[in-house]
C-alpha cells in the first residue's frame, strides 16, 4: 500500500530513509539532455523473499541528442501522487541496510541519472530527521516518522524534533547538557545526529551510523 503523502517536513531539518521497505518504487529519472532508454524501466522496485531484498529493474539513461526533444523524464500524472524527492550528493552507504529484513539499501547511482530521486514509499516506511547545518536540536524527541495505515487512510507520524538557530538557550539548574556529538564538537556547531539513544533503530545500525547517512538530502 503506497503512502498518500510525503513525510512531514520539520523546520530547519532534513529526513532520510536508512533503508527502503519492499514495495518501494524509485522513478527512473534522467538528467537534462538524457532520457530513459527505449523499452527501459519506468521505475525500480524493491522486492524480495524472506531472506533477501533487492531492487528489480535497472534504470538506464541515454543521450537525447539524437532525438528532437531534450525534455527531462518526469513521472506520469498518476505517478505524481507519491513524489519523494532527494538530491543525490553521494553514493556512500555507511550502513549495511540489507541487514534489515524486508528492506532494500539505497540503490547505487546509474549513469546520467537526475539530481533528484523520486521515491514512492509504502506503509511501514520509516524516515529519520536531523537538523540542518547551523541549527541544533532544542528538543530531540522521537526524530523519525513512520507511514501508518489508520481507518483505511495512510498517515505519517509527527516527528518531535525542534531545530533552533538560537545558540544561547536557557537551561534550568541541576540538569546536564546533552552529550556533544560523536565527533566531539559542541552541538551548536554541528548537525544534530539521530544516532542517540533516543532512537531504537537497530543496535548494530546505531553503532555504525555517522553523519554521512544524511549525505542524501531530502527536499
Amino acid at each position: 500500500e503506497l503512502c498518500d503523502d510525503d513525510p512531514p517536513e520539520i523546520p530547519h531539518a532534513t529526513f532520510k530513509a536508512m533503508a527502503y521497505k519492499e514495495g518501494t518504487m524509485l522513478n527512473c529519472e534522467c538528467k537534462r539532455g538524457f532520457r530513459r532508454i527505449k523499452s527501459g524501466s519506468l521505475y525500480m522496485l524493491c522486492t524480495g523473499n524472506s531472506s533477501h531484498s533487492s531492487w528489480d529493474n535497472q534504470c538506464q539513461c541515454t543521450s537525447s541528442a539524437t532525438r528532437n526533444t531534450t525534455k527531462q523524464v518526469t513521472p506520469q500524472p498518476e505517478e505524481q501522487k507519491e513524489r519523494k524527492t532527494t538530491e543525490m550528493q553521494s553514493p556512500m552507504q555507511p550502513v549495511d541496510q540489507a541487514s534489515l529484513p524486508g528492506h532494500c539499501r539505497e540503490p547505487p547511482p546509474w549513469e546520467n541519472e537526475a539530481t533528484e530521486r523520486i521515491y514512492h514509499f509504502v506503509v511501514g516506511q520509516m524516515v529519520y530527521y536531523q537538523c540542518v547545518q547551523g541549527y541544533r536540536a532544542l528538543h530531540r524527541g522521537p526524530a523519525e516518522s513512520v507511514c501508518k495505515m489508520t481507518h483505511g487512510k495512510t498517515r505519517w507520524t509527527q516527528p518531535q524534533l525542534i531545530c533552533t538557530g538560537e545558540m544561547e538557550t536557557s537551561q534550568f539548574p541541576g540538569e546536564e547538557k546533552p552529550q556533544a556529538s560523536p565527533e566531539g564538537r559542541p552541538e551548536s556547531e554541528t548537525s544534530c545526529l539521530v544516532t542517540t539513544t533516543d532512537f531504537q533503530i537497530q543496535t548494530e545500525m546505531a553503532a555504525t551510523m555517522e553523519t554521512s547517512i544524511f549525505t542524501t538530502e531530502y527536499q
Epitope: 517536513e9 523546520p11 518531535q160 524534533l161 533552533t164 536557557s170 534550568f172
Partner: antibody
Framework: QVQLVQSGAEVKKPGASLKISCKGS????????MHWVRQAPGQGLEWIGV????????IYAQKFQGRATMTVDKSTSTAYLELSSLRSEDTAVYYC????????WGQGTTVTVSS | DIQMTQSPSSLSASVGDRVTITCRAS??????LEWYQQKPGKAPKLLVY???TLAEGVPSRFSGSGSGTDFTLTISSLQPEDFGTYYC?????????FGQGTKLEIK
Amino acid sequence: QVQLVQSGAEVKKPGASLKISCKGSGYTFTDYAMHWVRQAPGQGLEWIGVISTYSGDAIYAQKFQGRATMTVDKSTSTAYLELSSLRSEDTAVYYCARGVTFDYWGQGTTVTVSS
Amino acid sequence: DIQMTQSPSSLSASVGDRVTITCRASQDISNYLEWYQQKPGKAPKLLVYNAKTLAEGVPSRFSGSGSGTDFTLTISSLQPEDFGTYYCQHHYDTPYTFGQGTKLEIK
C-alpha cells in the same frame, strides 16, 4: 489517554512572583517539548516559550526573556512556568501545550494580578 | 518576528453553510501552520497541523490548505457545535505566533 493537568487559579499582587505547574500523563513525557501560551481576558493567544522536557533547554519570546523561567521535573512528568515582577497586564489564563503541533493543551490556569 | 493575519475577524453563518477562514503570514512559512478551535472558557483544540493534515478525531468537514504565506481553513458544512474562535499559528521559527483569531457565530 493523554492529559495535561495544570495547577489551580492564583491571585497575586503586583511585583510578586508566580509558579504554575503542568503535569503530563498518558504518554512518555520526555518525548514531547512543552510550550507555554497565555490569553488575556477577551484577547488572543500569546506564545511565551518552549522547553525541552528532555534536556531542559528553553527558548522564550523576547517579551518574556528575563522575567519568565520554564523548568521541568522529569521524575514527576511536570513542567513549570515561573513569572516574576508581576504586573496587572499579566492577568491572563496560562496554558501548557504539548509537542511540535500543540496537539494537547492543559485546561488553563487563571492568574489575576491586582492590588 | 513573523506576523500572522487572519480574516475575517468575525463572521456569522448558518448551519450547512460552507465557511472559509484565511490566514496570511508575513513571510514564507512553508507548510508549518496549525489551526485551532477555542470555545469560551475552554483550552484551544488542534484541528489541522502542517497546513493540511487533520488532527485525530476531527470531523472530515474541516480541511486545511495553502503553503508559503496564504492558508485557508474550510468547514464544508457548518454544524451548530462549530461556533467558537479559530486561530492559526506557525511553527516555522521561534517565536511561534498566532493570528488574532476569527470569531465564528452561528446564525
